[in-house]
């Protein structure tokens, strides 16, 4: 087909020489020589679809997917990844080829998948498909640790079936609540697989390898604490092991603990008890409920009771498949230029999610915090008051979730002007979106109060940062205003800005900025 452009798709691998997150325009890294990805026309596809050779990337590597287009005239483009649109800024190289790039910094599982690039040129529209996967995903894994009872001993073994072999550590804390944060002095770490000291307040096991770190907390009911105000809930997938620890302290040894599922005592092989005297001579008992491989019928209320303490219960829910529950409706926010604000997503998920926040093709680390009610929350505050579209993406082994946010920053318009032989245009990105007025400056109206209404055309367009609206106003030149100074003013509830343009003057057009509060 004569009309089809000549397209070249390349992969650029980067050597990270900097831990900073770079913009797509200036790479914070050293580049290797580009690798040609072919980009062949895909047969039997509706529309014009080019397919690049599959790209395999090491975990944490940084790459650029690049398309070079040999087509006359301007091009516009849009990247789409996992149903999210990403901003696209084409530029031209020395051979006048259109260049479109997608930078992926520090490759993670979340960033693997299909990247679609839609290009519109003056002649035609076409799509380019890149498939990016992580190299050795079958070989490199990091699985959440789980617990097993050690044969013939009152001890727990922590197991993580990961490749490469992970370092396993127990993270122990004997304090309550906030002071059990990872870097707190109350936290003790033991780099071993077997744990004999099972009487602590908070017990977690963590496994780490090249892919990161995963932890599992030993679910605990403490009969000496008032029950939490929301139902404690534990999710497991069919086949996973169940471990719940019940702990109680009493002035003497004259008390016993029992576990029930719904209304029936747990069977003999599904619990074991340990007891010890604490420093103040009180007796601590713990009773573990465990099922080595759960089935659907292990779902229900598990109640730990004592002869000297009120009972407490937790709901164990066995699911076939993991899930992420959250509202995915997009949210719009409007804030002042110096207002403190964070995006937040509240979700319930099992297994634990991996997540990222994305803005203008840049990914940011995502932290999540567990709430008392079984939900978790992820907040993003590092927006630096940049307006536009922010994307939260979460996934676990079985589910994916994406939520879009739009941030608008209330500010006075700033006006930029440009002019040609036939028209003058003014642009502004203030928010709320400004309204426009045009005025003519003449002998009759030296203060430029004479309003121009003829030949004015206003529009809004999505420009600059993806999701940020820019308003523009264009004045078509007529004989009545040729050779005159005109003034365009953008105004919103926060103020007004104007720019003065001399129409039809020879050489470059002088612009006089005029700020009016």
């Amino acid at each position: 087909n004569q009309d089809l452009p000549v397209i070249k798709c390349v992969l650029i691998n980067h050597k990270n020489n900097d831990s900073s997150v770079g913009k797509s325009s200036s790479y914070p890294m050293v580049s290797e020589s580009p690798e040609d990805l072919g980009c062949a026309l895909r047969p039997q596809s509706s529309g014009t679809v080019y397919e690049a050779a599959a790209v395999e990337v090491d975990v944490s590597a940084s790459i650029t997917l690049q398309v070079l287009v040999d087509a006359p005239g301007n091009i516009s483009c849009l990247w789409v990844f996992k149903h999210s649109s990403l901003n696209c800024q084409p530029h031209f190289d020395l051979q006048n080829r259109g260049v479109v790039s997608m930078v992926i910094l520090k490759m993670t599982e979340t960033q693997a998948g299909e990247y679609l690039l839609f290009i519109q040129s003056e002649a035609t529209n076409y799509t380019i498909l890149f498939t990016v996967s992580i190299r050795n995903t079958l070989l490199y894994t990091l699985r959440r640790p789980y617990f097993r009872k050690m044969e013939n001993q009152d001890a727990l073994v922590c197991i993580s079936e990961s490749v490469p072999e992970p370092i396993v550590e127990w993270v122990l804390c004997d304090s309550q609540g906030e002071s059990c944060k990872e870097e707190s002095p109350a936290v003790v770490k033991k780099e071993e697989k077997v744990l004999h000291e099972l009487f602590g307040t908070d017990i977690r096991c963590c496994a780490r390898n090249e892919l990161g770190r995963e932890c599992t907390r030993l679910f605990t009911i403490d009969l000496n604490q008032t029950p939490q105000t929301t139902l404690p809930q534990l999710f497991l997938k069919v086949g996973e092991p169940l471990w719940i620890r019940c702990k109680a302290v009493h002035v003497n040894h004259g008390f016993g603990l029992t576990w029930e599922l719904e209304n029936k005592a747990l069977e003999e092989g599904n619990y074991f008890e340990m007891s010890t005297y604490s420093t103040n001579r009180t007796m601590i008992r713990i009773l573990f409920a465990f099922v080595s491989s759960v089935a659907r019928n292990d779902t229900g209320y598990y109640t730990c009771s004592s002869s000297k303490h009120p009972s407490q219960s937790a709901l164990v829910t066995i699911v076939e498949k993991g899930f992420i529950n959250a509202t995915n409706s997009s949210e719009d926010y409007e804030i002042d230029q110096y207002e403190e604000f964070c995006f937040s997503v509240r979700f319930k998920a099992y297994p634990q999610i991996r997540c990222t926040w994305t803005f203008s093709r840049k990914s940011f680390p995502c932290e999540q915090k567990g709430l008392d009610n079984g939900y978790s929350i992820s907040k993003f505050c590092n927006h630096k008051h940049q307006p536009g579209e922010y994307i939260f993406h979460a996934e676990n082994d079985d589910a994916q979730f994406t939520k879009m946010f739009t941030l608008n920053i209330r500010r006075k318009p700033q006006v930029l002007a440009e002019a040609s032989a036939s028209q003058a245009s003014c642009f502004s990105d203030g928010y709320p979106l400004p309204s426009w007025t045009w005025k003519k400056c003449s002998d009759k109206s030296p203060n430029c109060t004479e309003e121009i209404t003829e030949g004015v055309w206003n529009r809004k367009a999505n420009r600059k940062v993806f999701g940020q609206w820019v308003s523009s106003s264009t004045l078509n030149m007529s004989e009545a205003i040729k050779g005159f100074l005109v003034k365009c003013c953008a105004y919103n509830s926060l103020g007004t800005s104007c720019e003065t343009i001399l129409l039809n003057s020879p050489g470059p057009f002088p612009f006089i900025q005029d700020n009016i509060s």
């Epitope: 029950p227 139902l231 029992t258 719904e262 109640t303 009771s305 002869s307 009120p310 009972s311 219960s313």
Partner: nanobody, 110 residues
Framework: QVQLQESGGGLVQAGGSLRLSCAAS???????MAWYRQAPGKQRELVAA???????LYGDSVKGRFVISRDNAKYTVFLQMNSLKPEDTAVYYC?????WGQGTQVTVSS
């Protein structure tokens, strides 16, 4: 779905009595139910509960004055409160199977 509904709270003079009820639905027995209370600005505390050997358990401040009982057939637990004192003023909550009722206000005037 477990639901617990308390009733019987109200305003009473010091030395008087009140009987609170907690009607439960979605549960299989009243064996593990308990009463807790929360006074303004204070932590929630145990008032009375059943234990796993069938006996009862009471918070130190109510021993000898309050009695917990139940009607298994109606899945209802009661709290008989006698010799009430102004410091018994609180919202009283029923607890069972990890769930809480909405609470019922008890106010003891001096």
């Amino acid at each position: 779905q477990v639901q617990l509904q308390e009733s019987g709270g109200g305003l009473v003079q010091a030395g008087g009595s009140l009987r609170l009820s907690c009607a439960a639905s979605g549960i299989f027995s009243t064996n593990h139910m308990a009463w807790y209370r929360q006074a303004p600005g204070k932590q929630r505390e145990l008032v009375a509960a059943f234990t796993n050997d069938g006996s009862t358990l009471y918070g130190d401040s109510v021993k000898g004055r309050f009695v917990i009982s139940r009607d298994n057939a109606k899945y209802t637990v009661f709290l008989q409160m006698n010799s009430l004192k102004p410091e018994d003023t609180a919202v009283y909550y029923c607890y069972g199977l990890g769930h809480w009722g909405q609470g019922t206000q008890v106010t003891v005037s001096s």
